[in-house]
């Protein structure tokens, strides 16, 4: 494997890590997939320090992050955990709201315009972070 | 320059297995997620598989879903895709090509014919 | 699977015609689409992207428009080198979708 020793053109270094910060939207499963092509994942919030960094550069705006409960609990896609993890959802949320009328609940969660957290529909177009660990050896799968 | 280059391509029986390489120049092979598209004669083009630029994460149409296999060699700034189970329908000329952060494809190889016939 | 079409599948045209072309997504892609130009034998080659951005190298009578569901490439005035086949592309969803194609051919 290679380590990512610094971080890639348009991305943003912070705390040893790399962010790249959309400026169009797309659906939470298209921004995840977006991601992992480019060897990350959505974002993941682990500090009210890596939260301020985050809001900061998104500024007022719906955007996803690496959180969602589509298959029962709520998970990080990093396998951080979520119980005894950083959390900051708006009050009443997350509540799964189904009165929206787009079908089911709400299954993923986004900053919303205060940077607080919220659970919508996985569906809705929103901008999207992305976040990769320097000093991590990317493993690349053996040739077949 | 920057440059990609197919090889592999020719005539396989139905059933049969083929591997396709693309050889690139140019540019920093490892920074960039890359994919096969494929174009069946007289028709359009259809995106075949895609791979990250560490080799970590693959995904597929599913039209080729656990026949074909997408992989890399970064030390040979290489690509390369697998193909079992190959069915007449597969007949086509494959192009590998650069992906952009606006995910569409900015540099194509010239591409390489397989053909599947008994 | 996003679906897309284009019209019409083929046009004739002169040196100098304004040409558009149309493409229509089956899902809303906000401005998630590519213009590709296509000839036999040759590689696909980038026009446009993010439905309205010039591609490096690009000349500049070729112009896209669009966003949602509804895109047209423009050729202002068409040149003999641009008689060819394109296709558009969605970059929205997994997996990438191309329409069918536009070819354009001499009158």
């Known amino acids: 494997g290679s380590e990512r020793t610094c971080c890639p053109v348009n991305w943003v270094e912070h705390e040893r890590s790399c962010y790249w910060f959309s400026r169009s939207g797309k659906a939470w499963a298209d921004a995840d997939n977006y991601c992992r092509l480019e060897d990350a994942h959505l974002v993941v919030v682990t500090s009210w320090e890596e939260q301020k960094f985050v809001q900061h550069h998104i500024g007022p705006v719906n955007t996803w992050m690496g959180l969602h409960d589509q298959n029962g609990p709520w998970k990080w896609v990093d396998g951080t955990d979520y119980e005894t993890g950083f959390k900051n959802w708006r009050p009443e949320q997350p509540d799964d709201w189904y009165g929206h009328g787009l079908g089911g609940g709400e299954d993923c969660a986004h900053f919303t315009d205060d940077g607080r957290w919220n659970d919508d529909v996985c569906q809705r177009p929103y901008r999207w972070v992305c976040e990769t660990e320097l000093d991590k050896a990317s493993q690349e799968p053996p040739l077949l | 320059e920057v440059q990609l280059l197919e090889s592999g391509g020719g005539l396989v029986q139905p059933g049969g297995s083929l591997r396709l390489s693309c050889a690139a120049s140019?540019?920093?092979?490892?920074?960039?997620?890359m994919s096969w598209v494929r174009q069946a004669p007289g028709m359009g083009l259809e995106w075949v598989s895609a791979?990250?630029?560490?080799?970590?994460?693959?995904f597929y149409a599913d039209s080729v879903k656990g026949r074909f296999t997408i992989s890399r060699d970064n030390s040979k700034n290489t690509l390369y895709l697998h193909m079992n189970s190959l069915r007449a329908e597969d007949t086509a000329v494959y192009f590998c090509?650069?992906?952009?952060?606006?995910?569409?494809?900015?540099?194509w190889g010239q591409g390489t014919m397989v053909t599947v016939s008994s | 699977d996003i679906q897309m079409t284009q019209s019409p599948s083929s046009v004739s045209a002169s040196v100098g015609d304004r040409v558009t072309i149309t493409c229509r997504a089956s899902?809303?892609?906000?401005?998630?689409l590519a213009w590709y130009q296509k000839k036999p034998g040759k590689a696909p080659k980038l026009l446009i992207y993010?439905?309205?951005s010039l591609q490096s190298g690009v000349p500049s009578r070729f112009s896209g428009s669009g966003s949602g569901t509804d895109f047209i490439l423009t050729i202002s005035s068409l040149q003999p080198e641009d008689f060819a086949t394109y296709f558009c592309?969605?970059?929205?969803?997994?997996?990438?979708?191309f329409g069918p194609g536009t070819k354009v051919d001499i009158k």
């Open positions: 090509a650069k992906r952009t952060p606006s995910d569409v494809f900015d540099i």
């Open positions: 140019g540019f920093t092979f490892s920074s960039y997620a």
């Open positions: 791979i990250s630029g560490s080799g970590s994460n693959t």
């Open positions: 899902q809303d892609i906000s401005s998630w």
């Open positions: 993010d439905a309205s």
């Open positions: 592309q969605q970059a929205n969803s997994l997996p990438f979708t």
